[in-house]
């Protein structure tokens, strides 16, 4: 048979951050190539990454069409020199991925503190509204556009001279916090989607401290 040395893909894994979504699998091909198909539960299969020797396929363009849908992918294995060959059952070997719902499962990317401004004993901290690859009307949507009030940010802030981290939360991209006059503070933010059960938190933003470039101080 032409598929004697063809092996099915395995360990199919979705890797997704802020909706940039790649399907990965094993093994590295030896004398075989792969084609990926993706569909929604009720939709038709669409082929991607035709006859590739890679073990990953960028499916972002497909999943951003509707991030709230649940997707299934499958990876077909073909002999390298004879992609028309089929397995013993009359079709190529393939393996299904786990189901993937981008809105519920994409990892939240590391946020960035855009700026902070102190006015007296108040500090306004602004989080950058990161752009995603989700489009509406030919415009790329921000993370806030996609998730709305489902997305909150947790701010950790502390005096430069101490270790205890106070917290504040917002469902916008801005915090207004009280600080002690004459004290320097450091800040870090974390994106959170509380309604999720998995992938609820992002990694923390880089720490920004008062007295450094991003801040402004006004009496």
């Amino acid at each position: 048979s032409g598929t004697t040395n063809t092996v099915a893909a395995y360990n199919l894994t979705w890797k997704s951050t802020n909706f940039k979504t790649i399907l990965e699998w094993e093994p590295k091909p030896v004398n075989q190539v792969y084609t990926v198909q993706i569909s929604t539960k009720s939709g038709d299969w669409k082929s991607k990454c035709f006859y590739t020797t890679d073990t990953e396929c960028d499916l972002t363009d497909e999943i951003v069409k509707d991030v709230k849908q649940t997707y299934l992918a499958r990876v077909f294995s073909y002999p390298a020199g004879n992609v028309e060959s089929t397995g013993s059952a009359g079709e190529p070997l393939y393996e299904n991925s786990p189901e993937f719902t981008p809105y519920l499962e994409t990892n939240l990317g590391q946020p960035t503190i855009q700026s902070f401004e102190q006015v007296g004993t108040k500090v306004n901290v602004t989080v950058e509204d990161e752009r995603t690859l989700v489009r509406r009307n030919n415009t790329f949507l921000s993370l806030r556009d996609v998730f709305g009030k489902d997305l909150i940010y947790t701010l950790y802030y502390w005096k430069s001279s101490s270790s205890g981290k106070k917290t504040a939360k917002t469902n916008t991209n801005e915090f207004l916090i009280d600080v002690d006059k004459g004290e320097n503070y450091c800040f870090s933010v974390q994106a959170v989607i509380p309604s999720r059960t998995v992938n609820r938190k992002s990694t923390d933003s880089p720490v920004e401290c008062m007295g450094q470039e991003k801040g402004e101080f006004r009496e």
Partner: antibody, heavy 120, light 107 residues
């Protein structure tokens, strides 16, 4: 089912140490925040401190700062409260609680509590 | 730190009575206030979150409201299982703080 189970309480002399455990099941602690709250006999609830197990960040009530340390082992899905230099006024039932972490909901699940008695 | 001043500290009531407990925050806490019920020897249980939202599984006779920095827990018709101690808590800022508690006893 979400569950928190505290253990490690007991009788300890003033100046002594004790480590309480809070074993979580039904959820992953690194995706939430864990707080410790205590209640002295016949008294109200007093917040002790919190940890974000994801990054290790903590904050403590002034009454325990420098004496108590909260930590977490995400591989065991367990949070800890290390109590040093214990005083009679630390005698209380100690509860761990899960912080849902939203703007609207804070401590949604609590453990059953473990009694710590500081006495000579 | 934000103080949560709860009143009364105790009250006596009969089954079927309407009961009101109040909590005043020392500064703005938005709606970040929860109410808990605690029975002797048991852990507190969440009743109301975000000042006025009933937590899952809590009977509808419990309700919460907010007016500025004043927060109210109301039990519309007290039941035998409602005799307990009730606490308010703000989680608007760190550290979170609790009210002193209100013990609801049988008249």
């Amino acid at each position: 089912e979400v569950q928190l189970v505290e253990s490690g309480g007991g009788l300890v002399q003033p100046g002594g140490s004790l480590r309480l455990s809070c074993a979580a099941s039904g959820f992953t602690i690194s995706q939430y925040w864990i707080h410790w709250v205590r209640q002295a006999p016949g008294k109200g609830l007093e917040w002790v401190g919190y940890i974000d197990p994801y990054n290790g960040y903590t904050y403590y009530a002034d009454s325990v700062k420098g004496r108590f340390t909260i930590s977490a082992d995400t591989s065991k899905n367990t949070a800890y409260l290390q109590m040093n230099s214990l005083r009679a006024e630390d005698t209380a039932v100690y509860y761990c609680a899960r912080d849902y972490g939203s703007l609207r909901v804070s401590l949604d699940y609590w453990g059953q509590g473990t009694l710590v008695t500081v006495s000579s | 730190d934000i103080q949560m001043t709860q009143s009364p500290s105790s009250l006596s009531a009969s089954v079927g009575d309407r009961v009101t407990i109040t909590c005043r925050a020392s500064q703005d806490v938005n709606t970040a206030v929860a109410w808990y019920q605690q029975k002797p020897g048991k852990a507190p249980k969440l009743l109301i979150y975000s000042a006025s939202f009933l937590y899952s599984g809590v009977p509808s006779r419990f309700s919460g409201s907010r007016s500025g920095t004043d927060f109210t827990l109301t039990i519309s018709s007290l039941q035998p299982e409602d005799f307990a101690t009730y606490y308010c808590q703000q989680h608007y800022t760190t550290p979170p703080t609790f009210g002193q508690g209100t013990k609801v006893e049988i008249k």
